[in-house]
């Protein structure tokens, strides 16, 4: 090999040994029989030298240094070339660098042709190899603007003061051109200005100076975002930190097209604007940080760009003014992530800050909208709170468990409606009366309806899960001690059409000791099925529920358990059932942990099944699952 | 375990020639390159040479250029120095050493040594 | 050919000092500069490599440091088992070469 650097070409080249490999073997650069380890080429010298060994590439990189000053003299702007041509370098991955230094009042500005950079974080490489490491300065100071790869949105940067600009090649690369061209410009008064320009839809991520470092301190820097007027720009900020300052505030500040209110201030903890119509800019300003403990501001956001979506001109009003004790939150429903681009799903408050997911609370009237390409990746989940604190006041008190006609009109399927209902410890318990009688989920009988009523405690400490219930059944009431939630859960979106169906009223009722009463009116033709809370987990320690199991005087009741031993083992005290006529208070009781459970029995008036548990040994639990059938009492049951 | 174990102590008379050998265990010197470093009583070290075994091509330090030969048997995985036409300033300690290009571009193994003593 | 000077040629120190042994090249090496411990009737170890890197198992007192043609190694607190003889070599260029080396006793 021979390079030749011309006199005052300002370029140094340098040979030097590179990322060690699992090679053992040295390879060296041999200069007239010498073996040396690196070599530098200055300008005005003329080296020949080869290596020792077969693949230099897997030992050796050259780097190529060009300083140019545009301090002294005129500046060499336009196309940047790559000098020496890498037609006539070894084949070894080459970084070339320009050192430009210039005065604090003049701008430089990179230009970078199609195709434009794409910024890339700290761990990530570049899929071709290529990369462009940027940088600048403040008096003496380096600031690393970032590192970019080919096929992103950025076209321009404008710095002062100087730039380092660094493109690797790697060994086996074509590439012959550098790629950009310099352009002086006036004083930027700021750190650097990033241009970004979106053809189309997609999106770009973007750091501050020196990131994942702290940027600069008391620095501005701005991103120009070039979006086409049809298309809609939003931002969210991906990760952020925050110095302390002694002085100012860290802030963004936004121009955006139509905005009353330029620069629209923010700060880093804020919700950022989203649907954005056209170009606009975003400012990072820091702060005098404190001397002792400066901290550090940093930022990665992402600009998302896409088609606006026809709900995004449609403003929803959700009135939330008479409701307390609220909220309700519209998320992205759970996905599997793809690796394609998928356009941004957002919801937006009075259409301008968007998020992926949005809050609304309870006394005020909230306007929203969307900006996203399909809507079912999106749901809404409720929660209110009912609760009394007075007994005396609350007593047989009613409240309608339904869900606001507002909430079922946006275009968002509800996927949870979350009422919370509190009573006061040991004075009050509720009842639960619905619309329509309800239908305990099983494996043997599975809801098929597009909602379900959860029914669970809600005392923090206790694991008791009444069951799934659906309308269209045989109960015809639930009686619970405390405090429970219930949770309207939605399965398909035909609820739209049957939430006509639902109604569920709680009334606060004089307190009693069972954990929960089941009120069962079955209807002839069809076979009740009815299980255990906490079904799979078994029933709580020292639970006790019951089922008031109503015979019509034309008929007669099967009652049937479907396993032959309870299966509980008891650690301490007795689990047992009670079943009890209710006319005649005659009563059977089983011990669940010793007998085998009852066969098939009929009844030929209402009553009673109550099932109450010990402290069972773990893994021996307490699940049972019983039906009951009615049949015309005028057939012989002999 | 890498180990290089170096032949024995040799007296030998001004004008002799003398072969040292160095066999290597726990590698293959096809892999790495082999140096020889001479030190002589009571002075510092003085680098003699290298060998790539797997080609036998060898670089010395011009002052043991026909000095010192550098060979290499990779069958047996042994590398030898011979040394020609000795007198008193030979006498010294020699070693060998495994070169590691790969992180170090440095002597990571070494021999016990062998003396060479030169005497009439 | 690249001379290496190694000073002092002798050191004597007590155990918990801090000792500093310097190698000069007479031309820019670039860091290929290697530390070499040999202690009384053993053949060299590998101390450090690339001027500053410890090679596995070399404990945290030594350190390398240096650039252009000055380099430094350090013993931040003398051990007893650290008399030897310390070499600089340099690997930038053939022929290899050493520093004169530098004896450290213990008083």
């Known amino acids: 090999f021979e390079i030749a650097l011309p006199r005052e070409s300002n370029i140094t080249v340098l040979i030097k040994l590179g990322t060690p490999t699992l090679l053992a073997k040295p390879c060296y650069i041999v200069i007239s029989k010498r073996h040396i380890t690196m070599l530098s080429i200055k300008s005005g010298e003329r080296i020949v030298f080869t290596f020792s060994c077969q693949s230099p590439e897997n030992h050796f990189v050259i780097e190529i240094q060009k300083n140019i000053d545009c301090m002294s003299g005129p500046c060499p702007f336009g196309e940047v070339q790559l000098q020496p041509s890498t037609s006539l370098l070894p084949t070894l991955n080459r970084t070339f660098i320009w050192d430009v230094k210039a005065h604090k009042s003049i701008g430089l500005e990179l230009q970078f042709s199609i195709p434009r950079l794409r910024q890339i974080g700290p761990g990530e490489s570049c899929p071709d190899g290529v990369t462009h490491s940027i940088s600048g300065r403040i008096d003496a100071t380096v600031v690393r603007i970032g590192t970019f790869c080919s096929n992103g949105t950025v076209s321009r940067i404008k710095m002062q003061e100087g730039v380092k600009m660094a493109l690797h090649l790697p060994w086996f690369h074509p590439r012959n051109v550098s790629g950009f061209s310099i352009a002086n410009r006036s004083s930027i008064k700021r750190l650097c200005i990033i241009e970004s320009v979106f053809e189309g839809e997609g999106s770009a991520t973007l750091m501050s100076a020196n990131y994942p470092e702290g940027f600069p301190e008391d620095e501005l820097m701005t991103w120009q975002f070039v979006v086409p007027a049809h298309l809609r720009a939003s931002v969210s900020f991906l990760n952020f930190n925050l110095s302390n300052c002694e002085r100012k505030e860290e802030r963004v500040e936004y121009y955006i097209p139509g905005s009353t209110t330029n620069p629209e201030v923010f700060k880093l903890e804020d919700k950022q604007p989203g649907n954005m119509a056209g170009n606009f800019n975003l400012s990072l300003q820091g702060c005098d940080q404190d001397a002792q403990s400066p901290g550090i501001l940093r930022l990665q956001f992402q600009v998302l760009v896409q088609h606006p979506q026809n709900e995004s001109n449609k403003i929803y009003v959700v009135d939330l003014s008479n409701e307390r004790a609220m909220s309700l939150t519209i998320e992205p429903r759970p996905v599997k992530q793809s690796r394609k681009f998928v356009p941004g799903c957002f919801v937006c408050l009075e259409s301008r800050t968007c998020s992926s997911n949005l809050t609304l609370t309870s006394g005020s009237k909230h306007k929203i909208s969307f900006l996203c390409d399909d809507l079912t990746r999106l749901w809404m989940n409720v929660e209110k709170t009912i609760s009394c604190t007075d007994h005396r006041y609350c007593q047989r008190k009613s409240y309608s468990l339904q869900v606001p006609s507002d909430i079922l009109h946006l275009p968002v399927e509800l996927h949870d409606f979350s009422w919370k209902l509190l009573v006061p410890k040991d004075r009050l318990s509720l009842v639960l009366v619905p619309a329509q009688k309800l239908q305990q989920h099983t494996h043997e009988k599975p809801c098929n309806t597009s909602f379900s009523y959860l029914v669970a405690s809600a005392i923090p400490s206790q694991d008791l899960y009444f069951g799934s219930f659906c309308p269209g059944g045989s109960i015809k009431q639930i009686q619970v001690k405390q405090n429970i939630s219930v949770t309207l859960r939605t399965f398909a979106p035909s609820f739209q059409q049957e939430a006509s169906r639902q109604g569920l009223t709680v009334s606060f009722i004089p307190y009693f000791k069972e954990e929960g009463v089941f009120t069962v009116t079955p209807d002839t033709k069809s076979k009740v099925y009815l299980r255990t809370p906490n079904w799979d987990r078994g029933l709580p320690s020292l639970t006790s529920v019951s089922w008031n199991i109503s015979v019509p005087r034309d008929q007669v009741a099967c009652l049937t358990f479907f396993k032959e031993r309870s299966g509980v083992v008891c650690q301490t005290g007795r689990a047992f059932m009670i079943i009890q006529e209710q006319r005649t208070r005659a009563e059977e009781i089983f011990s669940l942990d010793e007998d085998v459970l009852p066969k098939p029995s009929f009844h030929h008036h209402s009553f009673w099944v109550n099932i109450s548990n010990c402290s069972p040994t773990s893994g021996k639990q307490l699940d049972l699952l019983f039906s009951v059938t009615l049949t015309p009492r005028t057939v012989d049951l002999t | 375990e890498v180990t290089l174990k170096e032949s024995g102590a040799e007296l030998v008379r001004p004008g002799a020639l003398v072969k040292l050998s160095c066999k290597a265990s726990g590698f293959n010197i096809k892999d790495y390159y082999m140096h020889w470093v001479k030190q002589r009583p009571e002075q510092g070290l003085e680098w003699i040479g290298w060998?790539?075994?797997?080609?036998?091509?060898?670089i010395y330090d011009p002052k043991f250029q026909g000095k010192a030969s550098i060979t290499a048997d990779t069958s047996s995985n042994t590398a030898y120095l011979q040394l020609s036409s000795l007198t008193s300033e030979d006498t010294a300690v020699y070693y060998c050493?495994?070169?590691?290009?790969?992180?170090?571009?440095?002597?990571?193994?070494w021999g016990q040594g062998t003396t060479v003593t030169v005497s009439s | 050919d690249i001379v290496m000077t190694q000073s002092p040629k002798f050191m004597s120190t007590s155990v918990g000092d801090r000792v500093s042994i310097t190698c000069k090249a007479s031309q820019d090496v670039s860091t290929a500069v290697t530390w070499y411990q040999q202690k009384p009737g053993q053949s060299p170890k590998l101390l450090i490599y690339?001027?500053?890197t410890r090679h596995t198992g070399v404990p945290d007192r030594f350190t390398g440091s240096g650039s252009g043609t000055d380099y430094t190694l350090t013993i931040s607190s003398v051990q007893a088992e650290d008399l030897a003889l310390y070499y600089c070599?340099?690997?930038?260029?053939?022929?290899?070469?050493f520093g004169g080396g530098t004896k450290l006793e213990i008083k």
């Open positions: 070599q340099q690997h930038y260029s053939t022929p290899y070469t």
């Open positions: 690339w001027a500053s």
């Open positions: 060998i790539d075994p797997e080609n036998d091509n060898t």
């Open positions: 050493a495994r070169f590691y290009g790969s992180y170090y571009y440095a002597m990571d193994y």
